[in-house]
């Protein structure tokens, strides 16, 4: 999906008001210095592409984050403010949610959510030069 035409300011507002808090809750008890940020993004559409991938695509050691509150809210924001955000992707998320039996917070998942926090912070500061 091409995130170019999303309403970035409304997605940013949703992140600041609620998604960010859910990410913090998920990471509670973890030191902010525990994980290095290895995933980066260069502009808002790119950031959303990376956020979508890390949030909804299963990775080794972290089967799926799709059932977490921050993920459901991310999906809702993209569905509302990204025109034509594909039903295929929305339905794929539902399949992932059904496939997941239990919510186990592994160290790999914590690392992944730490990367997500970095991507969201970058999304909120689009004018900053890439390090």
């Amino acid at each position: 999906y091409d995130f170019t035409n999303c309403d970035f300011e409304k997605i940013k507002a949703a992140y600041l008001s609620t998604i960010s808090k859910d990410l913090i809750t998920y990471m509670s008890g973890t030191k902010s210095t525990e994980f290095n940020n290895t995933v980066s993004c260069s502009n808002r559409p790119h950031c959303l592409t990376e956020i979508q991938s890390l949030t909804f695509n299963p990775t080794a050691g972290c089967a799926s984050l799709a059932k977490e509150m921050f993920a459901m809210k991310t999906k809702a924001a993209l569905a509302i403010w990204c025109p034509g955000y594909s039903e295929t992707q929305i339905n794929a998320t539902q399949a992932m949610k059904k496939a997941r039996k239990s919510k186990v917070t592994t160290n790999k998942c914590l690392e992944q959510v730490s990367q997500l926090q970095g991507l969201w912070r970058r999304f909120n500061r689009p004018l900053l030069k890439q390090q």
């Epitope: 409304k10 949703a14 609620t18 509302i80």
Partner: antibody, heavy 121, light 111 residues
């Protein structure tokens, strides 16, 4: 069973405001969006805006921006729509409608019975 | 953005088929597969009949079907019955600002 129950008929003077409520029951309030749609006498349907309880955000049609406010009280699973600076053209039946599940907010699979609002001096 | 165009009225005899068209633009109907159809009897709330172009909610008769070609969506009702007499509205997702646009409505008369 799943239903939306709306508040009763209203008669208002031009310039006044009106608030219509919509009580949800029989389904998980936070999993859906609630939209408001109006229908003037003998006319078609017009989408006004929606509220997504999961995010706590609203989205309004440009035509109604600044004049409509949609709010929710999750504790009572009630959504309200307030329309201000009423004029005679606002005379219509106002419906609340539930956006489809699984984030498919653009179609409406459950409707309230409608609340007639008359604006007359 | 303006409302998609529907014929004001169509008619058919019991047992026949009718098709109601809904013509929009590339910014709404042509741009997304997010088209729904609603049936409304006089004095009643609308009822969802078709969503996402051609999907039927549970409980809706398979006599109702939807399709799309370019900027035009269509609702076909086969084997017309007396209770099908109603107004029919198409609706399309129309981007993040307008979000949903309804067509002007079509009155179906069973003759």
């Amino acid at each position: 069973q799943e239903q939306l129950v709306q508040s009763g008929d209203e008669v208002k003077k031009p310039g006044a405001s009106v608030k219509v409520s919509c009580k949800s029951s029989g389904f998980t309030f936070g999993s859906y969006a609630i939209s408001w749609v109006r229908q003037a006498p003998g006319q078609g349907l017009e989408w006004m805006g929606m509220l997504v309880p999961l995010l706590g955000v609203t989205n309004y049609a440009e035509k109604f921006q600044g004049r409509v406010t949609i709010t929710a009280d999750p504790s009572t699973t009630t959504t309200s729509m307030e329309l201000s600076s009423l004029r005679s053209e606002d005379t219509a039946v106002y419906y609340c409608a539930r956006g489809g599940s699984n984030y498919l907010y653009w179609y409406f699979d459950l409707w309230g019975p409608g609340t007639p609002i008359t604006v007359s001096s | 953005q303006s409302a998609p165009i529907q014929p004001r009225s169509v008619s058919g005899s019991p047992g026949q088929s009718v098709t109601i068209s809904c013509t929009g633009t590339s910014s709404d109907i042509g741009g997304y597969n997010r088209i729904s159809w609603y049936q409304q009897h006089p004095g009643k709330a609308p009822k969802l009949m078709i969503y996402d172009v051609s999907k039927r909610p549970s409980g809706v008769s398979d006599r109702f079907s939807g399709s799309k070609s370019g900027n035009t969506a269509s609702l076909t009702i086969s084997g017309l019955q007396a209770e099908d007499e109603a107004d029919y509205y198409c609706s399309s997702y129309a981007g993040t600002d307008t979000f949903v646009l309804f067509g002007g409505g079509t009155q179906l008369t069973i003759v």
